[in-house]
Protein backbone atom coordinates (compact mmCIF):
# COMPACT_ATOMS: atom_id res chain seq x y z
CA UNK A 1 0.00 0.00 0.00
CA UNK A 2 1.00 3.55 -1.08
CA UNK A 3 0.55 5.92 1.78
CA UNK A 4 -1.90 8.96 1.20
CA UNK A 5 0.28 11.98 0.64
CA UNK A 6 -0.75 15.85 -0.46
CA UNK A 7 0.62 16.08 -4.12
CA UNK A 8 3.06 19.00 -4.08
CA UNK A 9 2.45 22.27 -5.52
CA UNK A 10 3.03 22.25 -9.26
CA UNK A 11 3.15 18.73 -9.55
CA UNK A 12 -0.61 17.77 -10.14
CA UNK A 13 -0.61 15.53 -13.57
CA UNK A 14 -3.26 17.15 -16.09
CA UNK A 15 -1.89 14.41 -18.58
CA UNK A 16 -0.29 11.05 -18.62
CA UNK A 17 2.57 12.11 -20.71
CA UNK A 18 6.43 11.65 -19.59
CA UNK A 19 6.90 14.23 -17.23
CA UNK A 20 5.67 11.59 -14.80
CA UNK A 21 8.89 8.92 -15.42
CA UNK A 22 10.60 10.59 -12.55
CA UNK A 23 7.75 10.78 -9.91
CA UNK A 24 8.79 8.79 -6.87
CA UNK A 25 5.53 6.49 -5.99
CA UNK A 26 4.18 8.83 -3.40
CA UNK A 27 4.27 11.22 -5.99
CA UNK A 28 2.58 9.27 -8.71
CA UNK A 29 -0.09 8.12 -6.37
CA UNK A 30 -1.23 11.57 -5.03
CA UNK A 31 -1.00 13.73 -7.94
CA UNK A 32 -2.11 11.25 -10.83
CA UNK A 33 -6.49 11.01 -10.65
CA UNK A 34 -7.42 7.70 -11.51
CA UNK A 35 -9.98 8.42 -13.43
CA UNK A 36 -7.16 10.69 -15.60
CA UNK A 37 -5.23 7.56 -16.23
CA UNK A 38 -8.43 5.42 -17.38
CA UNK A 39 -9.24 7.42 -20.03
CA UNK A 40 -5.82 7.71 -21.14
CA UNK A 41 -4.49 4.38 -20.53
CA UNK A 42 -3.35 4.38 -24.26
CA UNK A 43 -0.49 6.60 -23.11
CA UNK A 44 1.11 4.43 -20.58
CA UNK A 45 2.68 1.92 -23.34
CA UNK A 46 4.53 5.02 -24.69
CA UNK A 47 5.91 5.98 -21.12
CA UNK A 48 9.10 3.83 -20.09
CA UNK A 49 7.77 3.52 -16.64
CA UNK A 50 9.23 1.26 -13.80
CA UNK A 51 7.87 -1.96 -12.72
CA UNK A 52 7.69 0.06 -9.25
CA UNK A 53 5.43 2.60 -11.18
CA UNK A 54 3.68 0.24 -12.84
CA UNK A 55 2.49 -1.12 -9.18
CA UNK A 56 1.14 2.69 -8.43
CA UNK A 57 -0.87 2.86 -11.60
CA UNK A 58 -2.56 -0.62 -11.29
CA UNK A 59 -2.71 0.45 -7.66
CA UNK A 60 -4.82 3.53 -9.01
CA UNK A 61 -7.21 1.60 -11.19
CA UNK A 62 -7.75 -1.09 -8.53
CA UNK A 63 -9.61 1.60 -6.49
CA UNK A 64 -11.44 3.30 -9.25
CA UNK A 65 -12.69 -0.28 -11.10
CA UNK A 66 -13.31 -2.51 -7.50
CA UNK A 67 -15.87 -4.89 -9.65
CA UNK A 68 -12.90 -5.27 -12.51
CA UNK A 69 -11.87 -2.89 -15.53
CA UNK A 70 -14.34 -2.21 -18.59
CA UNK A 71 -12.66 -3.56 -21.64
CA UNK A 72 -12.04 -0.07 -23.18
CA UNK A 73 -9.18 -0.13 -20.12
CA UNK A 74 -8.50 -3.69 -20.50
CA UNK A 75 -7.43 -2.67 -24.32
CA UNK A 76 -5.00 -0.40 -23.82
CA UNK A 77 -3.25 -1.80 -20.42
CA UNK A 78 -0.45 -2.71 -22.98
CA UNK A 79 2.94 -3.74 -20.43
CA UNK A 80 0.92 -2.89 -17.35
CA UNK A 81 -1.10 -6.56 -17.80
CA UNK A 82 2.16 -8.11 -16.71
CA UNK A 83 1.36 -6.61 -13.62
CA UNK A 84 -2.25 -8.27 -13.17
CA UNK A 85 -2.80 -11.69 -11.28
CA UNK A 86 -5.49 -14.07 -12.28
CA UNK A 87 -7.43 -13.09 -9.69
CA UNK A 88 -7.44 -9.72 -10.97
CA UNK A 89 -8.48 -10.82 -15.02
CA UNK A 90 -11.38 -13.01 -13.45
CA UNK A 91 -12.85 -10.13 -12.87
CA UNK A 92 -12.82 -8.77 -16.54
CA UNK A 93 -15.45 -9.50 -19.51
CA UNK A 94 -13.06 -9.72 -22.25
CA UNK A 95 -15.45 -9.98 -25.91
CA UNK A 96 -13.18 -7.84 -28.34
CA UNK A 97 -10.77 -10.24 -30.19
CA UNK A 98 -8.40 -7.22 -30.49
CA UNK A 99 -8.41 -6.90 -26.69
CA UNK A 100 -7.39 -10.46 -26.63
CA UNK A 101 -4.58 -9.81 -29.37
CA UNK A 102 -3.30 -6.54 -27.47
CA UNK A 103 -2.65 -8.48 -24.59
CA UNK A 104 -1.52 -11.46 -25.69
CA UNK A 105 1.17 -9.29 -27.80
CA UNK A 106 2.13 -7.87 -24.81
CA UNK A 107 3.26 -11.50 -23.85
CA UNK A 108 4.86 -11.96 -26.46
CA UNK A 109 8.40 -13.69 -26.01
CA UNK A 110 7.03 -14.96 -22.27
CA UNK A 111 5.55 -18.53 -22.04
CA UNK A 112 1.84 -19.12 -21.43
CA UNK A 113 1.61 -17.39 -17.77
CA UNK A 114 -1.27 -17.99 -15.40
CA UNK A 115 -2.43 -14.48 -16.43
CA UNK A 116 -2.47 -15.58 -19.61
CA UNK A 117 -4.41 -18.68 -19.21
CA UNK A 118 -6.88 -16.93 -17.37
CA UNK A 119 -7.43 -14.68 -19.79
CA UNK A 120 -7.93 -17.09 -22.60
CA UNK A 121 -9.96 -19.06 -20.22
CA UNK A 122 -12.24 -16.22 -19.56
CA UNK A 123 -12.55 -15.26 -23.45
CA UNK A 124 -13.31 -18.55 -24.60
CA UNK A 125 -16.08 -19.09 -21.83
CA UNK A 126 -17.43 -15.79 -22.74
CA UNK A 127 -17.48 -16.81 -26.26
CA UNK A 128 -19.15 -19.88 -25.75
CA UNK A 129 -17.09 -21.74 -28.00
CA UNK A 130 -13.41 -21.80 -29.31
CA UNK A 131 -14.02 -20.01 -33.07
CA UNK A 132 -11.80 -20.20 -35.85
CA UNK A 133 -10.91 -16.63 -35.66
CA UNK A 134 -9.96 -17.25 -31.77
CA UNK A 135 -8.26 -19.98 -32.26
CA UNK A 136 -6.02 -19.02 -35.26
CA UNK A 137 -5.07 -16.15 -32.74
CA UNK A 138 -3.94 -18.43 -30.10
CA UNK A 139 -2.31 -20.78 -31.96
CA UNK A 140 -0.42 -17.74 -33.92
CA UNK A 141 1.01 -16.74 -30.29
CA UNK A 142 0.93 -19.94 -28.39
CA UNK A 143 1.92 -22.77 -31.05
CA UNK A 144 0.80 -25.53 -28.37
CA UNK A 145 -1.84 -24.13 -27.47
CA UNK A 146 -4.89 -26.29 -28.54
CA UNK A 147 -2.71 -29.21 -26.82
CA UNK A 148 -2.99 -27.88 -23.72
CA UNK A 149 -6.73 -28.18 -24.04
CA UNK A 150 -8.44 -31.10 -21.83
CA UNK A 151 -10.19 -33.55 -24.50
CA UNK A 152 -13.38 -32.30 -22.26
CA UNK A 153 -12.33 -29.01 -23.56
CA UNK A 154 -11.40 -30.02 -27.47
CA UNK A 155 -14.76 -31.45 -27.54
CA UNK A 156 -16.71 -27.69 -27.75
CA UNK A 157 -13.92 -26.65 -30.84
CA UNK A 158 -16.36 -26.62 -34.13
CA UNK A 159 -14.84 -28.57 -37.00
CA UNK A 160 -14.69 -25.56 -39.17
CA UNK A 161 -11.75 -24.01 -36.85
CA UNK A 162 -9.40 -26.85 -37.42
CA UNK A 163 -8.47 -25.02 -40.61
CA UNK A 164 -6.97 -22.90 -38.44
CA UNK A 165 -4.68 -25.41 -36.97
CA UNK A 166 -0.92 -25.91 -38.54
CA UNK A 167 0.90 -29.36 -37.99
CA UNK A 168 3.39 -27.51 -35.52
CA UNK A 169 0.21 -27.12 -33.00
CA UNK A 170 -0.16 -30.56 -32.06
CA UNK A 171 3.55 -31.21 -31.74
CA UNK A 172 2.64 -31.67 -27.94
CA UNK A 173 -1.06 -33.14 -28.33
CA UNK A 174 -1.01 -37.04 -27.06
CA UNK A 175 -3.53 -39.53 -28.07
CA UNK A 176 -6.36 -38.70 -26.23
CA UNK A 177 -6.19 -35.47 -27.42
CA UNK A 178 -5.63 -36.58 -30.76
CA UNK A 179 -8.94 -38.76 -30.43
CA UNK A 180 -10.83 -35.83 -30.14
CA UNK A 181 -9.54 -33.75 -32.69
CA UNK A 182 -8.84 -36.33 -35.65
CA UNK A 183 -12.59 -36.73 -36.71
CA UNK A 184 -13.50 -33.35 -36.25
CA UNK A 185 -10.39 -32.86 -39.29
CA UNK A 186 -12.02 -35.88 -41.17
CA UNK A 187 -14.96 -33.76 -41.59
CA UNK A 188 -13.46 -30.63 -42.40
CA UNK A 189 -11.50 -31.52 -45.03
CA UNK A 190 -13.91 -34.42 -46.29
CA UNK A 191 -14.08 -32.43 -49.38
CA UNK A 192 -11.06 -32.22 -50.59
CA UNK A 193 -9.35 -34.45 -53.23
CA UNK A 194 -6.90 -37.51 -52.04
CA UNK A 195 -3.43 -36.13 -51.81
CA UNK A 196 -4.78 -32.78 -50.43
CA UNK A 197 -7.14 -34.32 -48.00
CA UNK A 198 -3.83 -36.32 -46.74
CA UNK A 199 -1.69 -33.19 -46.49
CA UNK A 200 -4.32 -31.76 -44.18
CA UNK A 201 -5.26 -35.03 -42.39
CA UNK A 202 -1.83 -35.86 -41.78
CA UNK A 203 -0.58 -34.90 -38.30
CA UNK A 204 -4.32 -35.75 -36.77
CA UNK A 205 -3.76 -38.91 -37.51
CA UNK A 206 -2.78 -39.70 -34.05
CA UNK A 207 -6.66 -40.76 -33.28
CA UNK A 208 -7.34 -42.37 -36.59
CA UNK A 209 -9.12 -45.97 -36.40
CA UNK A 210 -7.97 -49.17 -38.28
CA UNK A 211 -10.33 -48.84 -40.92
CA UNK A 212 -9.49 -45.19 -41.76
CA UNK A 213 -5.91 -46.41 -42.27
CA UNK A 214 -7.08 -49.41 -44.37
CA UNK A 215 -8.97 -46.65 -46.95
CA UNK A 216 -5.51 -44.19 -46.57
CA UNK A 217 -3.33 -47.64 -47.56
CA UNK A 218 -5.94 -47.44 -50.67
CA UNK A 219 -4.53 -44.00 -52.19
CA UNK A 220 -0.75 -44.20 -52.64
CA UNK A 221 -0.47 -42.01 -50.17
CA UNK A 222 3.24 -43.00 -48.89
CA UNK A 223 3.08 -41.45 -45.33
CA UNK A 224 6.55 -40.87 -43.98
CA UNK A 225 8.26 -43.12 -40.76
CA UNK A 226 7.06 -39.96 -38.41
CA UNK A 227 3.67 -40.07 -38.73
CA UNK A 228 3.36 -43.79 -39.10
CA UNK A 229 5.45 -44.19 -35.34
CA UNK A 230 2.75 -41.44 -33.84
CA UNK A 231 -0.12 -43.44 -35.21
CA UNK A 232 -2.39 -45.37 -32.45
CA UNK A 233 -0.53 -48.85 -31.79
CA UNK A 234 -4.41 -50.41 -31.54
CA UNK A 235 -5.17 -48.76 -34.78
CA UNK A 236 -1.87 -50.29 -36.50
CA UNK A 237 -1.94 -53.63 -34.98
CA UNK A 238 -5.19 -55.39 -37.52
CA UNK A 239 -3.28 -54.26 -40.39
CA UNK A 240 -1.91 -56.64 -42.78
CA UNK A 241 1.94 -56.29 -44.27
CA UNK A 242 0.29 -56.01 -47.85
CA UNK A 243 -1.76 -52.84 -45.91
CA UNK A 244 1.33 -51.08 -44.27
CA UNK A 245 3.40 -51.34 -47.65
CA UNK A 246 0.71 -49.30 -48.96
CA UNK A 247 0.60 -47.25 -46.97
CA UNK A 248 4.22 -46.30 -46.85
CA UNK A 249 4.89 -46.32 -50.11
CA UNK A 250 8.85 -46.03 -50.17
CA UNK A 251 8.85 -44.86 -46.81
CA UNK A 252 7.94 -49.36 -45.79
CA UNK A 253 12.02 -49.62 -45.79
CA UNK A 254 12.63 -47.50 -42.51
CA UNK A 255 10.53 -49.80 -40.47
CA UNK A 256 13.80 -51.85 -39.92
CA UNK A 257 15.15 -48.92 -37.86
CA UNK A 258 12.09 -49.28 -35.83
CA UNK A 259 11.59 -52.57 -35.18
CA UNK A 260 12.40 -52.55 -31.85
CA UNK A 261 10.16 -49.50 -30.88
CA UNK A 262 6.16 -49.27 -31.05
CA UNK A 263 4.00 -49.71 -32.52
CA UNK A 264 6.43 -51.21 -35.36
CA UNK A 265 7.07 -53.97 -32.77
CA UNK A 266 3.86 -54.94 -32.11
CA UNK A 267 2.57 -54.84 -35.32
CA UNK A 268 5.64 -57.37 -36.22
CA UNK A 269 4.23 -59.39 -33.19
CA UNK A 270 0.83 -59.92 -35.39
CA UNK A 271 2.50 -61.01 -38.62
CA UNK A 272 3.10 -63.67 -39.81
CA UNK A 273 7.10 -64.21 -40.53
CA UNK A 274 6.48 -65.42 -44.51
CA UNK A 275 4.85 -62.22 -45.20
CA UNK A 276 6.94 -59.93 -42.82
CA UNK A 277 9.42 -61.94 -45.26
CA UNK A 278 8.04 -60.50 -48.23
CA UNK A 279 9.16 -57.22 -47.72
CA UNK A 280 12.75 -58.08 -47.61
CA UNK A 281 13.86 -55.48 -45.03
CA UNK A 282 15.12 -58.58 -42.77
CA UNK A 283 12.38 -58.05 -40.04
CA UNK A 284 12.39 -60.56 -37.47
CA UNK A 285 9.92 -62.08 -34.57
CA UNK A 286 7.00 -62.29 -36.48
CA UNK A 287 4.61 -65.82 -36.03
CA UNK A 288 6.80 -68.59 -36.96
CA UNK A 289 5.46 -70.12 -40.07
CA UNK A 290 2.77 -73.30 -39.80
CA UNK A 291 1.66 -71.64 -36.04
CA UNK A 292 -2.08 -71.06 -35.37
CA UNK A 293 -3.04 -67.65 -34.70
CA UNK A 294 -6.19 -67.61 -32.33
CA UNK A 295 -8.13 -64.12 -31.96
CA UNK A 296 -8.87 -64.90 -27.82
CA UNK A 297 -10.94 -61.97 -27.58
CA UNK A 298 -13.23 -63.19 -31.33
CA UNK A 299 -13.46 -66.29 -29.82
CA UNK A 300 -14.90 -64.77 -26.30
CA UNK A 301 -17.64 -62.87 -28.33
CA UNK A 302 -18.23 -66.14 -30.23
CA UNK A 303 -18.64 -68.11 -27.13
CA UNK B 1 18.80 -3.50 -38.75
CA UNK B 2 18.65 -0.74 -35.91
CA UNK B 3 22.10 0.76 -35.72
CA UNK B 4 23.84 3.52 -32.99
CA UNK B 5 26.98 4.72 -34.24
CA UNK B 6 28.86 7.35 -31.86
CA UNK B 7 31.86 9.89 -32.45
CA UNK B 8 33.11 12.74 -30.66
CA UNK B 9 35.46 10.79 -28.37
CA UNK B 10 38.97 11.76 -27.72
CA UNK B 11 41.59 13.00 -25.43
CA UNK B 12 40.90 16.01 -23.45
CA UNK B 13 42.43 17.70 -20.94
CA UNK B 14 40.47 18.31 -17.29
CA UNK B 15 38.07 20.79 -17.57
CA UNK B 16 37.68 20.56 -21.22
CA UNK B 17 35.02 20.02 -23.18
CA UNK B 18 33.78 17.29 -25.54
CA UNK B 19 30.51 16.74 -27.40
CA UNK B 20 29.91 12.94 -28.32
CA UNK B 21 27.06 12.18 -31.05
CA UNK B 22 25.28 9.17 -31.91
CA UNK B 23 23.33 8.33 -35.33
CA UNK B 24 20.62 5.76 -35.52
CA UNK B 25 19.46 4.56 -38.70
CA UNK B 26 16.77 1.31 -39.25
CA UNK B 27 14.46 2.53 -36.68
CA UNK B 28 12.12 5.17 -35.91
CA UNK B 29 13.95 7.04 -33.74
CA UNK B 30 11.47 9.92 -33.15
CA UNK B 31 9.31 7.29 -30.97
CA UNK B 32 12.35 6.00 -28.72
CA UNK B 33 13.40 7.12 -25.66
CA UNK B 34 17.70 7.20 -25.77
CA UNK B 35 20.25 6.72 -22.97
CA UNK B 36 23.86 7.21 -22.56
CA UNK B 37 25.76 4.40 -20.51
CA UNK B 38 29.70 4.50 -19.74
CA UNK B 39 32.03 2.38 -19.07
CA UNK B 40 35.34 3.40 -17.38
CA UNK B 41 38.16 0.89 -18.29
CA UNK B 42 38.10 -2.80 -16.59
CA UNK B 43 34.96 -1.28 -14.46
CA UNK B 44 31.52 -1.90 -14.82
CA UNK B 45 28.25 0.51 -16.75
CA UNK B 46 26.94 3.19 -15.33
CA UNK B 47 23.91 5.04 -16.71
CA UNK B 48 25.04 8.44 -17.56
CA UNK B 49 21.97 10.33 -18.99
CA UNK B 50 18.45 9.47 -20.72
CA UNK B 51 16.47 11.82 -23.08
CA UNK B 52 12.79 11.13 -23.73
CA UNK B 53 11.26 10.98 -26.86
CA UNK B 54 10.30 14.27 -27.00
CA UNK B 55 13.36 15.42 -25.54
CA UNK B 56 11.20 17.11 -23.06
CA UNK B 57 12.31 14.81 -19.68
CA UNK B 58 15.48 14.00 -19.24
CA UNK B 59 17.86 12.54 -16.61
CA UNK B 60 21.56 12.74 -15.36
CA UNK B 61 23.37 10.65 -12.95
CA UNK B 62 24.48 12.73 -9.97
CA UNK B 63 28.04 12.09 -10.77
CA UNK B 64 27.73 14.30 -14.31
CA UNK B 65 24.53 16.79 -13.40
CA UNK B 66 25.64 20.15 -13.94
CA UNK B 67 28.62 19.16 -16.16
CA UNK B 68 26.92 17.10 -18.89
CA UNK B 69 23.70 18.03 -21.08
CA UNK B 70 21.80 15.60 -23.41
CA UNK B 71 19.78 16.68 -26.45
CA UNK B 72 18.42 14.89 -29.95
CA UNK B 73 17.36 16.12 -32.92
CA UNK B 74 14.98 13.83 -34.28
CA UNK B 75 14.98 15.60 -38.08
CA UNK B 76 18.36 13.91 -38.20
CA UNK B 77 17.85 10.89 -35.70
CA UNK B 78 21.08 12.07 -34.00
CA UNK B 79 21.53 11.60 -29.77
CA UNK B 80 23.83 14.14 -28.30
CA UNK B 81 26.42 14.13 -24.92
CA UNK B 82 28.09 17.61 -24.26
CA UNK B 83 30.42 17.34 -21.76
CA UNK B 84 31.59 20.11 -20.13
CA UNK B 85 34.18 20.68 -17.09
CA UNK B 86 35.64 16.88 -17.54
CA UNK B 87 37.23 14.91 -14.94
CA UNK B 88 39.90 11.93 -14.76
CA UNK B 89 36.84 10.05 -13.63
CA UNK B 90 34.75 10.52 -16.72
CA UNK B 91 37.49 8.53 -18.72
CA UNK B 92 35.44 6.18 -20.25
CA UNK B 93 33.56 4.24 -22.88
CA UNK B 94 30.50 5.96 -23.91
CA UNK B 95 27.78 3.65 -25.49
CA UNK B 96 24.66 5.31 -26.64
CA UNK B 97 21.98 2.76 -26.28
CA UNK B 98 18.29 2.20 -27.10
CA UNK B 99 15.24 -0.01 -25.81
CA UNK B 100 13.33 -1.81 -27.99
CA UNK B 101 9.90 -0.20 -27.87
CA UNK B 102 8.29 -2.71 -25.40
CA UNK B 103 10.42 -3.12 -22.83
CA UNK B 104 11.62 0.79 -22.47
CA UNK B 105 13.79 0.19 -19.56
CA UNK B 106 16.40 -2.54 -20.61
CA UNK B 107 18.85 -1.56 -23.59
CA UNK B 108 18.29 -3.91 -26.48
CA UNK B 109 20.42 -1.87 -28.53
CA UNK B 110 24.11 -0.61 -28.49
CA UNK B 111 26.61 1.35 -30.62
CA UNK B 112 30.10 0.22 -30.98
CA UNK B 113 30.90 3.23 -28.01
CA UNK B 114 33.69 6.05 -28.70
CA UNK B 115 36.44 6.49 -26.11
CA UNK B 116 37.16 9.51 -24.35
CA UNK B 117 40.00 9.98 -22.50
CA UNK B 118 40.47 13.00 -19.88
CA UNK B 119 44.19 13.56 -19.12
CA UNK B 120 46.51 16.14 -18.76
CA UNK C 1 19.34 0.46 -5.50
CA UNK C 2 22.33 -1.45 -5.69
CA UNK C 3 22.63 -4.72 -7.33
CA UNK C 4 26.03 -6.75 -6.06
CA UNK C 5 27.10 -9.72 -8.50
CA UNK C 6 29.00 -13.04 -7.19
CA UNK C 7 31.42 -14.37 -7.82
CA UNK C 8 33.37 -11.47 -9.49
CA UNK C 9 35.12 -13.41 -11.38
CA UNK C 10 35.00 -17.20 -12.13
CA UNK C 11 37.55 -20.19 -14.03
CA UNK C 12 34.90 -22.43 -15.97
CA UNK C 13 35.72 -25.21 -18.11
CA UNK C 14 33.74 -25.82 -21.71
CA UNK C 15 31.02 -28.02 -21.13
CA UNK C 16 31.04 -26.80 -17.32
CA UNK C 17 27.70 -25.38 -15.53
CA UNK C 18 27.85 -21.74 -14.38
CA UNK C 19 25.87 -19.72 -11.85
CA UNK C 20 25.95 -16.43 -11.56
CA UNK C 21 23.88 -14.67 -8.91
CA UNK C 22 23.05 -10.78 -8.09
CA UNK C 23 21.54 -9.72 -5.19
CA UNK C 24 19.40 -6.08 -5.13
CA UNK C 25 19.62 -3.76 -2.01
CA UNK C 26 15.91 -3.75 -1.98
CA UNK C 27 13.25 -5.80 -3.80
CA UNK C 28 12.77 -5.45 -7.53
CA UNK C 29 10.22 -7.82 -8.29
CA UNK C 30 11.10 -9.41 -11.64
CA UNK C 31 12.33 -6.25 -12.93
CA UNK C 32 16.18 -7.69 -13.69
CA UNK C 33 18.42 -8.08 -17.25
CA UNK C 34 21.14 -10.03 -17.74
CA UNK C 35 23.80 -8.87 -20.38
CA UNK C 36 27.38 -10.79 -21.64
CA UNK C 37 30.19 -8.15 -23.13
CA UNK C 38 32.99 -9.60 -24.85
CA UNK C 39 36.57 -7.04 -24.63
CA UNK C 40 36.39 -4.24 -26.59
CA UNK C 41 32.38 -4.62 -27.63
CA UNK C 42 28.88 -3.31 -26.18
CA UNK C 43 26.80 -5.56 -24.00
CA UNK C 44 24.44 -7.69 -25.41
CA UNK C 45 21.06 -8.29 -23.92
CA UNK C 46 20.46 -12.02 -23.04
CA UNK C 47 17.53 -12.01 -20.27
CA UNK C 48 14.71 -9.62 -19.34
CA UNK C 49 11.92 -9.80 -16.54
CA UNK C 50 14.64 -12.10 -14.67
CA UNK C 51 13.99 -15.23 -16.59
CA UNK C 52 12.61 -14.31 -20.65
CA UNK C 53 15.15 -15.28 -22.61
CA UNK C 54 15.84 -12.45 -25.27
CA UNK C 55 14.97 -13.56 -28.52
CA UNK C 56 18.08 -15.12 -30.69
CA UNK C 57 19.74 -16.25 -27.45
CA UNK C 58 20.47 -19.91 -26.75
CA UNK C 59 18.46 -21.99 -24.49
CA UNK C 60 21.64 -22.63 -22.37
CA UNK C 61 21.13 -19.09 -20.95
CA UNK C 62 18.61 -18.75 -18.37
CA UNK C 63 17.51 -16.41 -15.62
CA UNK C 64 15.56 -16.97 -12.23
CA UNK C 65 14.67 -15.10 -9.37
CA UNK C 66 12.37 -12.59 -7.88
CA UNK C 67 12.31 -9.39 -4.92
CA UNK C 68 16.58 -9.74 -3.95
CA UNK C 69 17.56 -12.58 -5.16
CA UNK C 70 18.45 -13.80 -9.02
CA UNK C 71 20.41 -16.30 -11.33
CA UNK C 72 22.35 -16.60 -14.52
CA UNK C 73 22.78 -19.78 -15.73
CA UNK C 74 24.52 -21.24 -18.40
CA UNK C 75 23.52 -25.28 -18.45
CA UNK C 76 26.65 -26.02 -21.23
CA UNK C 77 29.57 -23.27 -20.96
CA UNK C 78 30.99 -23.28 -24.59
CA UNK C 79 33.73 -21.70 -25.58
CA UNK C 80 32.07 -17.94 -27.38
CA UNK C 81 30.21 -17.67 -23.66
CA UNK C 82 33.73 -16.83 -22.04
CA UNK C 83 32.80 -13.03 -21.64
CA UNK C 84 32.20 -10.56 -18.82
CA UNK C 85 27.97 -10.60 -17.78
CA UNK C 86 26.53 -7.72 -15.94
CA UNK C 87 22.83 -7.56 -14.02
CA UNK C 88 20.58 -4.33 -14.59
CA UNK C 89 17.30 -3.73 -12.53
CA UNK C 90 14.74 -1.61 -13.94
CA UNK C 91 12.21 -1.67 -10.95
CA UNK C 92 12.91 2.00 -10.07
CA UNK C 93 14.95 5.21 -11.36
CA UNK C 94 17.77 5.45 -11.46
CA UNK C 95 18.04 2.32 -13.75
CA UNK C 96 21.39 0.34 -12.36
CA UNK C 97 23.94 -2.14 -13.04
CA UNK C 98 25.80 -4.55 -11.02
CA UNK C 99 29.51 -4.91 -11.11
CA UNK C 100 30.26 -7.31 -13.34
CA UNK C 101 31.24 -11.18 -13.18
CA UNK C 102 34.19 -12.25 -15.67
CA UNK C 103 33.83 -15.75 -16.84
CA UNK C 104 37.22 -16.70 -17.70
CA UNK C 105 38.99 -20.08 -19.35
CA UNK C 106 40.41 -22.32 -16.39
Known amino acids: EVEKTACPSGKKAREIDESLIFYKKWELEACVDAALLATQMDRVNAIPFTYEQLDVLKHKLDELYPQGYPESVIQHLGYLFLKMSPEDIRKWNVTSLETLKALLEVNKGHEMSPQVATLIDRFVKGRGQLDKDTLDTLTAFYPGYLCSLSPEELSSVPPSSIWAVRPQDLDTCDPRQLDVLYPKARLAFQNMNGSEYFVKIQSFLGGAPTEDLKALSQQNVSMDLATFMKLRTDAVLPLTVAEVQKLLGPHVEGLKAEERHRPVRDWILRQRQDDLDTLGLGLQGGIPNGYLVLDLSMQEALS | QVQLVESGGGLVKPGGSLRLSCAAS????????MSWIRQAPGKGLEWVSY????????YYADSVKGRFTISRDNAKNSLYLQMNSLRAEDTAVYYC?????????????WGQGTLVTVSS | IQLTQSPSSLSASVGDRVTITCRAS??????LAWYQQKPGKAPKLLIY???SLESGVPSRFSGSGSGTDFTLTISSLQPEDFATYYC?????????FGGGTKVEIK
Open chain 3, 26 to 31: QGISSA
Open chain 2, 26 to 33: GFTFSDYY
Open chain 3, 88 to 96: QQFNSYPLT
Open chain 3, 49 to 51: DAS
Open chain 2, 51 to 58: ISSSGSTI
Open chain 2, 97 to 109: ASPYKKRRTVFDY
